[in-house]
Interface confidence: low
């Protein structure tokens, strides 16, 4: 192993290297958690996945699938690889010195390659307030349904909330009389009425398609996943970036919290969740336009998203 | 595997000095990184210094100047000089070894370190 990385870092790989690939930018105060999820290739289900720390000198292993370490108390990262392409990362208690650049990666068949790679922000502790607020998140964790719903980034100005909230409130009232006028329409006219809820999904500007980041209070590992988390749904396919690597530790190593595994379907492109506090979702209701009194039902479209985090 | 012994642990006057080591055994060869953590009561384990095989000694900001770390390849282990101890430094101080990622890493059981004033 060593000497193949050797090579490689003689011989350097095809493809683009470590520099290319921006990192996603994620912040999250001191004492919350991340929580990460790359997207590898089925081809790649047995081979090892590592989350690593990018020095100068490499990248350094924090937490590895190959083994099962028994660290003592004091853990802070911990990685589970559910199958089926899916590799989850959460990282605890997060303190000043985590600020910095990560990655997920995979020794597959054509060797090592970043799945993803994350620049961690740090900022300085919330205000007791803000902290019971994440921290109403903290039992939760995340499933991944076809629509899903996106909170505020935790890193926006505190002063644009009132004004979102506003403007979620205004929207909300206006859908929901649309929705309660067409129910009337649709009743005076003795027809039958299908209805289909959906969630609205929505995306966050700046963000690089990526890993799913789950951002809470709480100190543990993640357990059952829940639909009312707020997260966001970003959809571009994984760049794989070929590298060499060395180690270099800063952290604990890791146990492995349990989760479902996904179904075992392609590789999903990676995604991206901040969650800061509690949202509430508005429903949107489509009458149904069957004559035979059948509901239809399409999925809400997610505008398109082109964005790319600005350096 | 990687069995990993600490020694050199006890009870110090503040401003005084202790000097840790390390012993690794086992499937030695592919140690990486060794490394010292600790952990005070209440508080979460930290890096205190480590050292790559051909690399330089990293130390935490609180070690610097103080705390010195150096590690004999041939024989597996790493010691840690502390100098000018303080009562912050009280604390339960582990032995770390990372191997290469394939492999994993591997601690020590710990080896208590009491700063009096």
């Known amino acids: 192993m060593g000497l193949t990385l050797l090579l490689l870092l003689l011989l350097g790989l095809e493809g683009q290297g470590i520099v290319g690939s921006l990192p996603e930018v994620l912040q999250a105060p001191v004492g919350s958690s991340i929580l990460v999820q790359c997207h590898y290739r089925l081809q790649d289900v047995k081979a090892q996945k590592v989350w690593c720390r990018f020095l100068p000198e490499g990248c350094q292993p924090l937490v590895s699938s190959a083994v099962d370490r028994r660290a003592p108390a004091g853990r802070r990262t911990f990685l589970t690889d559910l199958g089926g392409g899916l590799l989850q990362v959460e990282m605890v208690t997060l303190q000043e010195e985590d600020a910095g650049e990560y990655g997920c990666m995979v020794d597959g068949a054509r060797g090592p390659q970043i799945l993803h790679r994350v620049s961690l922000n740090i900022l300085p502790p919330e205000e007791e307030e803000e902290t019971h607020k994440i921290g109403s998140l903290a039992e939760n964790a995340f499933s991944d349904p076809a629509g899903s719903a996106n909170p505020l980034e935790p890193s926006q100005d505190e002063k644009s909330i009132p004004l979102i909230w506003g403007a979620v409130l205004l929207v909300g009232l206006l859908v929901a009389a649309v929705v309660l006028f067409a129910v009337m329409a649709k009743r005076k006219q003795g027809n039958r009425l299908g209805v289909c809820g959906r969630f609205l999904s929505s995306r966050v500007s700046g963000m690089n398609p990526s890993s799913v980041v789950h951002h809470v209070s709480d100190s543990g590992p993640a357990a059952e996943l829940p639909l009312d988390v707020p997260h966001i749904r970003l959809d571009s396919p994984p760049s794989f970036d070929n590298t060499t690597y060395t180690s270099l530790p800063l952290d604990s190593p890791s146990g492995k919290p349990s989760l479902p595994a996904p179904s075992s379907l392609p590789p999903l492109p990676p995604k991206v969740l901040v969650c800061s506090k509690p949202v509430t979702y508005a429903t949107v209701i489509f009458p149904g336009g069957n004559k035979g009194g059948g509901t239809s039902c399409g999925p809400a479209q997610n505008p398109p998203n082109n964005q790319t985090p600005s350096s | 595997q990687v069995q990993l012994v600490e020694s050199g642990g006890g009870l110090v006057q503040a401003g005084g000095s202790l000097t840790l080591s390390c012993a690794a055994s086992?499937?030695?060869?592919?140690?990486?990184?060794m490394a010292w953590y600790r952990q005070a009561p209440g508080k979460q384990r930290e890096l205190v210094a480590n050292?790559?095989?051909?690399?330089?000694?990293k130390y935490a900001d609180f070690a610097k100047g103080r705390f010195t770390i150096s590690r004999d390849n041939t024989k597996n282990t790493i010691s840690l000089q502390m100098n000018s101890l303080k009562p912050e430094d009280t604390a339960v101080y582990y032995c770390?070894?990372?191997?290469?990622?394939?492999?994993?890493?591997?601690w020590g059981q710990g080896t208590q370190v009491t700063v009096s004033s």
């Open positions: 770390n070894a990372l191997l290469d990622w394939r492999l994993g890493d591997y």
């Open positions: 086992g499937s030695t060869s592919g140690i990486n990184v």
């Open positions: 050292k790559a095989r051909g690399g330089l000694p």
